[in-house]
Interface confidence: medium
């Protein structure tokens, strides 16, 4: 048989198909059911659910679906030693205390096991002091307090609002601040949108709300106590005090009624401008301690949470391709939430469930993809993206060898306004073409592409007439597969207006008020949005599991490496006398920018006209387009983060949600003016450059004709 | 790469005024701290003062010694760092030193310059 | 102000001897942000001084592997392993952790 005829029995089976077959009543279905009770890694009720997805799988149609196992280190608060932050007075009394749990919302009032908010892995500690205001507690809000206004954070509490940057950064620069705590809180300016409700009535944040989640600095670690290395029954593992990623210092997050009371006192410093200024009626100011009558107070944490080597369990499905069965297309995303997961993860889940049983369906009719398709259910992502990492590292070296694509599906909205899509390069012209092959669901646009509702709504800052699609960072399971293997990836949501929604995530985002009614009554009571990212993440799945020559574009990389080196080449400028005085030169970062830009350009028209029907020609053309991501990895790493191998994209060391475009150079000039020795400084940068310079030399060197 | 030369110094009688200029080249000027040293023959180092950057509002701060006296200033434009010297002492004889400092180290010196304060 | 006290005053050596610089202050030199501002200089006659060492114990770049600084608190020490030609001159300390800055009253490297 033919290439074609193997995996198209019938005409009807193409991607129309497979499109037609996805449902949004299918998907609301699947998300009740994946919402009733809490899904938190490493317990019961997770593995009873791993368990479930898996018998599901098979009835679907998939040719083998597994449970892999882990033992990973998890973090859990005392159930009989609750952690709370109290103001005590002089006499050590405690004249208030933060709330010890979330009142859990109408009709889940009798549900067990709900976590009360902490802040995983946290050390145990009772450390008591003044409290220091440190605003977002990013690395410019630190600049501002130390340098600016001569604020010393040494021995201070820091209390710290969310937003704006992942909370494992703000963690680590109190740490390295000197803080002794950190108290995280959500205030109304970032996480309750005017005019909007508060929950049950709306999607804003109440009061006594809070948001969970881990506070590690992993750097693509995996599980803290082997990294590298896959957490099995032989695996050998670290003391807790070399463990990877955990924080030193007692943390914790609380709502912003409890923080009204602890910001209400503040006294000593004035906040420096209305960029530290939340929406609580509170003089922001920053401390260090309370005011006047009020001085002889301090804060005090309890932390007594404990962590442990847990058992997690993901789900791996695999759809067996016909033509070429050993490169891999995968689609992800986690199970495992913090309390009901309404959002996160679980409508993201919802979608990869519709997706498995529609690829069934059509396999049930004797269709199979060109190459394989691997799903999987990932458990503890909420715990440092601990289950995808696990598995990537045992299967490290088929991955490499085999990977063609990943395609993350964590929540499918965190809005209900526009398509959000980050990806590689290479798959801007799939994304693009399918969009435009796609109905919109956005009101207004009836009839209308989901291109032209994309791009209107999100347009381009570069081109017009083309929408927006941003850089992978990280705080996803896609992490490892991008940032350590170098396999193409990419991910698509619904999201909010960023233009008129300022808040940081969605308002609910890992507190117990995320759950089923809040997506059915305020995000998307037709589940429509949630059907049009079903179609975006398996339409993308669809095509690089069967598109013959593979859907991957490699001029676009060009493009985008041209904007990376003259963004940072315009950094670097920023100090010219230094760049003369030790001969700081980006020459050669851009002549191997040209170069590759025209080895692109060749391999495109060699690609657009080679013989389709040879198949080993073909093989040929598609591995170099699978290599090409590949080709990227730098198999040192970066700077103090050997996991983050990729030399164009890494998470930003300020903000693991962000992506940096050539990070190693981004980084050795990063505040480059405060190094004690510029000499040394401004040679890493030269270095860094040459390292940039010599993988894009490379990757564009495996594009070149074979022979 | 970083240079700093002191100018200005000379012989002087007690009570006169004198001033030394440090003109620099190689980094960045206005990114930086800039302080005078001096050194008394046969005597250990004494810091004297130091200027803060624009966004600091070119703040200064002296050593008791010569505080009341002595005046530093910058001009961003020329990359310079001045010392004004008045009501000169004897005790004010040294070899003049500006530094370029980097958070709380003084990385670069100049060669320094002589100031001999005699009748 | 903080008081630094350096010795020996002399340190007669011969090349390719290992020798030792001690440093104390009258106070503790750790900055309440947990660093400590103690660095050593080389000035040789007629020239400005030579950042060596920078907060106890990092090496300035372009000097030798042969010079190490250690210690904390109060006390402090710049070795040289193998004392060669070119590091004869006078050695002095600096403390930035305390204003105003202060400067050990050196140590002479000559040849025994």
């Known amino acids: 048989k033919s290439s074609s005829e193997a995996t198209n029995i019938t005409p009807k089976h193409n991607m129309k198909a497979f499109l037609d077959e996805l449902k949004a009543e299918n998907i609301k279905k699947f998300l009740h059911n994946f919402t009733q009770i809490p899904h938190l890694a490493g317990t019961e009720q997770n593995f009873q659910l791993a368990k479930q997805i898996q018998s599901q799988w098979k009835e679907f149609g998939l040719d083998s679906v597994e449970l892999t196992h882990y033992d990973v280190l998890l973090s859990y608060p005392n159930k009989t030693h609750p952690n709370y932050i109290s103001i005590i007075n002089e006499d050590g009394n405690e004249i208030f205390n933060t709330s010890l749990f979330e009142p859990p919302p109408a009709g889940y009032e009798n549900v067990s096991d709900i976590v009360p908010p902490f802040s995983a892995f946290s050390p145990q500690g009772m450390p008591e002091g003044d409290l220091v205001y440190v605003n977002y507690a990013r690395t410019e809000d630190f600049f501002k307090l130390e340098r600016d206004m001569k604020i010393n954070c040494s021995g201070k509490i820091v209390i710290a609002r969310y937003g704006k940057v992942f909370r494992g950064n703000k963690v680590k620069n109190a740490q390295l601040a000197g803080a002794t705590g950190v108290i995280l809180y959500s205030d109304p300016a970032d996480y309750f949108a005017p005019g909007v409700k508060s929950y049950p009535d709306g999607w804003n944040l109440p009061g006594g709300g809070v948001q969970r989640g881990n506070i590690l600095n992993l750097n693509g670690a995996g599980d803290p106590l082997t990294p590298g290395y896959p957490a099995n029954e032989y695996a050998y593992r670290r003391g807790i005090a070399e463990a990877v990623g955990l924080p030193s210092i007692p943390v914790h997050p609380i709502g912003y009624y409890d923080a009204q009371k602890l910001l209400e006192k503040m006294g000593g410093s004035a906040s420096p401008d209305s960029s530290w200024r939340g929406s609580l009626k509170v003089p922001y100011n920053v401390g260090p301690g309370f005011t006047g009558n009020f001085s002889t107070q301090k804060v005090k944490m309890h932390i007594h949470s404990t962590s442990e080597v847990t058992r997690i369990y993901n789900v791996i499905g695999t759809l067996r391709g016909a033509v070429e069965p050993d490169r891999y297309v995968i689609l992800g995303g986690h199970r495992d939430s913090w309390v009901f997961g309404g959002i996160d993860p679980q409508s993201g889940a919802a979608v990869v469930h519709e997706i498995v049983r529609s690829f069934g369906t059509l396999k049930k009719e004797g269709w199979r993809p060109r190459r394989t398709i691997l799903f999987a259910s990932w458990d503890a992502e909420e715990f440092g993206l601990l289950g995808s990492t696990e598995w990537a590292e045992e299967n490290s070296r088929l991955l490499q060898e085999r990977g063609v694509a990943y395609i993350n599906a964590d929540s499918s909205i965190e809005g209900n306004y526009t398509l959000r899509v980050d990806c590689t390069p290479l798959m801007y012209s799939l994304v693009y073409n399918l969009t435009k092959e796609l109905e919109s669901p956005d009101e207004g646009f009836e009839g209308k592409s989901l291109y032209e509702s994309w791009t209107k709504k999100s347009p381009s800052p570069e081109f017009s007439g083309m929408p927006r699609i941003s850089k992978l960072g990280s705080g996803n399971d896609f992490e490892v597969f991008f940032q350590r293997l170098g396999i193409a990836s990419g991910r698509a949501r619904y999201t909010k207006n960023w233009e008129t929604n300022k808040f940081s995530s969605y308002p609910l985002y890992h507190s117990v008020y995320e759950t089923y009614e809040l997506v059915e009554k305020f995000y998307d009571p037709m589940f429509k949005y949630h059907l049009t990212v079903a179609q975006v993440r398996g339409g993308m799945v669809f095509e690089l599991a069967n598109s013959v020559v593979l859907p991957f574009d490699c001029r676009d990389y060009a493009v985008v490496l041209r904007k990376y080196a003259d963004k940072i080449y315009n950094i670097s400028m920023k100090h010219p006398q230094e760049m003369k005085t030790y001969s700081v030169s980006f020459d050669s970062l851009f002549s191997a920018v040209k170069n590759f830009t025209e080895i692109a350009s060749k391999f495109s028209e060699r690609l657009r006209d080679f013989d389709k029907s040879n198949p080993i020609l073909l093989r040929m053309m598609n591995d170099q387009l699978m290599f090409l991501e590949r080709a990227f990895i730098d198999p040192l790493g970066l700077p103090d983060r050997p996991f983050y191998r990729h030399v164009i994209y890494a998470p930003s060391s300020h903000n693991k949600y962000a992506g940096e475009s050539f990070p190693g150079i981004y980084d050795a000039l990063f505040d480059i003016e405060s190094k004690v020795d510029p000499s040394q400084a401004w040679g890493e940068v030269k270095r860094q450059i040459s390292i940039a310079t010599f993988t894009v030399q490379a990757a564009a060197e495996t594009l070149s004709e074979v022979a | 790469q970083v240079q700093l030369v002191e100018t200005g110094g000379g012989l002087v009688r007690p009570g006169n005024s004198l001033k030394l200029s440090c003109v620099t080249s190689g980094f960045t000027f206005s990114n930086y701290r800039m302080h005078w040293l001096r050194q008394p023959p046969g005597k250990r180092l004494e810091w004297i003062a130091v200027?803060?950057?624009?966004?600091?509002?070119?703040?200064?701060s002296y050593a008791e010694s010569v505080k009341g006296r002595f005046a530093i200033s910058r001009d961003d434009s020329k990359s310079s760092v001045y010392l004004e010297m008045n009501r000169l002492r004897e005790e004010d004889t040294a070899t003049y030193f500006c530094?370029?400092?980097?958070?709380?180290?003084?990385?670069?010196w100049g060669q320094g310059t002589l100031v001999t304060v005699s009748a | 102000d903080v008081v630094v006290t350096q010795t020996p005053l002399s340190l007669p050596v011969s090349l390719g001897d290992q020798a030792s610089i001690s440093c104390r202050s009258s106070q503790s030199l750790v900055h309440s942000y947990g660093n400590t501002y103690l660095h050593w200089y080389l000035q040789k006659p007629g020239q400005s001084p030579k950042l060596l060492i920078y907060?106890?114990?990092n090496r300035f770049s372009g000097v030798p592997d042969r010079f190490s600084g250690s210690g904390s608190g109060t006390d402090f020490t710049l070795k040289i392993s193998r004392v060669e030609a070119e590091d004869l001159g006078v050695y002095f300390c600096s403390q930035t952790t305390h204003v105003p800055w202060t400067f050990g009253g050196g140590t002479k490297l000559e040849i025994k």
């Open positions: 530094s370029r400092e980097l958070g709380q180290v003084l990385v670069f």
């Open positions: 907060k106890v114990s």
């Open positions: 200027i803060t950057v624009k966004s600091d509002n070119y703040g200064s």
